[in-house]
């Protein structure tokens, strides 16, 4: 008799695919333009990044440090009316993009959150949710939760509007801070909170230091369902270099949770190549003409029209693993093992019951490395096979599809593999 | 159950003021969201403003934003809607309602669950 199916995990959206973050409506669009009804225009291009949820804004109207000029309830009329933004939520519904909406109050200002009136400010963010639920908004973002006095019982407040709406909503909390028990104590008291921090921001410089980090986290967390971004708001660029993007594209969308990104982190949007760009927030580059500041500033490679034609570029396979990533049984849920590889090397494998499996091999070194996979120190039910297909691999030149034998997998300088396996009884 | 009547309106030339009240009973009133709502002779009843039931969030429609002041005193479990500088296009059977669920209402009127019986404003030019 074949063995018992394993019983599906409840699966809400957010844990179907990643995360895209805009917070500059204007920089997003570019041009002088920077409005919801342009952003309507964009949605078929989230589509083509096959992310579940667009992470807006702010978009409320807020005066610099001044909360009585703060209002949650009204959209800056820089970014349209109300009815354009009804108008948004409807074209995303239909095209199946999520929309959450940020209510940090005090965006323009020094302290996110004012320094002073924290109780009024907390009752106009509480009003605001109930006033956005009810106009669709499937979710909100609040940031620089580290400057909000009694975070945790706040936020267990809002959790509770939010999920007494519908169990279908969700409540992102973004952080600056990096320490794992400053974080651990946000979660402790919110079950279904998603929170952003930046926590990997120091990852960037070896196998062995993010394997570390990535596994205290899971255990750390237990079986809470996370969310994985270098920072709250930041590109990645602002993190890396450029040669570990791909590594961390493939990384971030195979980690068990939901994968954040912020506008540009598919292209390697870098504000360090834009001269006198924000390196908060730097125009997106549409095309060579987005960034019209210093003629033959940009070329086509480093814009989402030249990426989209090259499939060998940062924008493919950002798509690519988008694609995977909402599709298979052992990336939506499956279960996580890592296991030594070798120095400078992080491996993983992801597997679902019977489900095809995942196993990733990242090459955070400057230099080619032979992985020594140790499968001894994976458990019976995640044992390796001698040969796993190649599905894809953050460098060019690899036969995809070929079969790779385990024992004697090499990686080039920062590659990253990901290679796939049947189930076997 | 909540009761609510309202009171305050009345026949006003354009440019004028009137204040409308809306008394409520029953069920506790500091836990509603408050609206206001209008209808116009052969047209649909439309949303005016909403008030959220600490009284720190307001919200208006277009139409009315700087004109009309929505406001509440829990205490006298009472709601008001400052009308200033109005227009003929006001005249309008005006409603109030309460929303049970939410702390803030919205501006769609499914989501009141109680309204009041209405009072008739008449703004001539």
């Known amino acids: 008799r074949a063995p018992r199916c394993r019983e599906l995990p409840a699966q809400k959206w957010w844990h179907t695919g990643a995360l895209y973050r805009i917070g500059d409506l204007q920089a997003f669009q570019g041009h002088g333009a920077g409005n919801l009804a342009g952003l309507k225009g964009r949605l078929d291009y989230l589509s083509s990044l096959k992310v579940k949820g667009l992470v807006l804004g702010p978009i409320h109207k807020n005066q610099k440090d001044d909360v009585a000029q703060t209002d949650l309830l009204q959209i800056d009329p820089n970014f349209g009316s109300k009815e354009d933004f009804d108008s948004l939520l409807q074209s995303a519904k239909k095209k199946s993009i999520r929309v959450i909406l940020d209510l940090t109050p005090n965006y323009r200002g020094e302290n996110s959150w004012f320094s002073t009136q924290v109780d009024t400010v907390a009752t106009k963010v509480k009003d605001a949710l109930e006033f956005w639920l009810q106009a669709g908004v499937d979710g909100f973002q609040v940031r620089d939760i580290e400057n909000l006095k009694d975070a945790s019982s706040f936020l267990a407040e809002w959790q509770n509007i939010t999920k007494g709406f519908s169990e279908d909503r969700l409540l992102i909390a973004g952080t600056n801070s990096s320490d794992l028990q400053q974080i651990l104590s946000l979660l402790e008291s919110n079950k279904d909170l998603l929170l952003t921090s930046s926590y990997l921001s120091d990852s960037g410089s070896t196998g062995e230091h993010t394997k570390s980090l990535v596994t205290q986290y899971l255990n750390a967390t237990g079986n809470r369902w996370c969310s994985w971004s270098l920072s709250q708001a930041r590109l990645l660029t602002s993190f890396l270099p450029a040669q570990l993007l791909r590594l961390y594209q493939l990384m971030l969308f195979t980690l068990p949770g939901t994968p954040v990104f912020s506008y540009g982190d598919e292209i390697g949007l870098d504000a360090a190549a834009l001269p006198g760009q924000p390196m908060e927030a730097p125009v997106m580059l549409w095309d060579e003409s987005s960034f019209p500041d210093i003629p033959g500033a940009v070329s086509a490679n480093m814009t989402v029209k030249g990426q989209s034609e090259d499939p060998g570029s940062l924008l493919s396979l950002f798509r690519r693993l988008s694609d995977q990533r909402s599709k298979e049984r052992s990336l939506l849920h499956g279960d996580f093992h890592a296991f030594s590889a070798g120095p400078g090397l992080f491996s993983y494998i992801r597997h679902w019951d019977q489900n095809e499996r995942f196993l990733v091999v990242l090459n955070f070194g400057d230099v080619g490395l032979s992985a020594g996979l140790q499968a001894s120190d994976l458990p019976a039910s995640a044992s390796l096979p001698a040969k796993a297909d190649l599905l894809l691999s953050t460098q060019p030149g690899r036969e995809e599809g070929s079969p790779l034998e385990l024992e004697r997998l090499k990686l080039e300088p920062h590659e990253g593999l990901l290679l796939r396996f049947p189930y076997a009884a | 159950q909540v009761q609510l009547v309202e009171s305050g309106g009345g026949l006003v030339q354009a440019g004028g003021s009137l204040r409308l009240s809306c008394a409520a009973s029953g069920r506790a009133f500091s836990s509603n969201g408050m609206g206001w709502f209008r209808q116009a002779p052969g047209k649909e009843r439309e949303f005016v403003a909403t008030?959220?039931?600490?009284?720190?969030?307001?919200y208006y429609a277009d139409s009315v934003k700087g004109r009309f002041t929505i406001s509440r005193d829990n205490a006298k479990n009472t709601v008001y809607l400052q009308m200033n500088s109005l227009k003929p296009e006001d005249t309008a059977v005006y409603f109030c309602?309460?929303?049970?669920?939410?702390?803030?209402?919205?501006?769609?009127?499914?989501?009141?669950?109680?309204w009041g019986q209405g009072t008739q404003v008449t703004v001539s030019s």
């Open positions: 309602a309460a929303d049970t669920r939410h702390c803030m209402g919205y501006t769609k009127d499914e989501g009141y669950a109680y």
């Open positions: 008030i959220s039931c600490s009284g720190t969030s307001t």
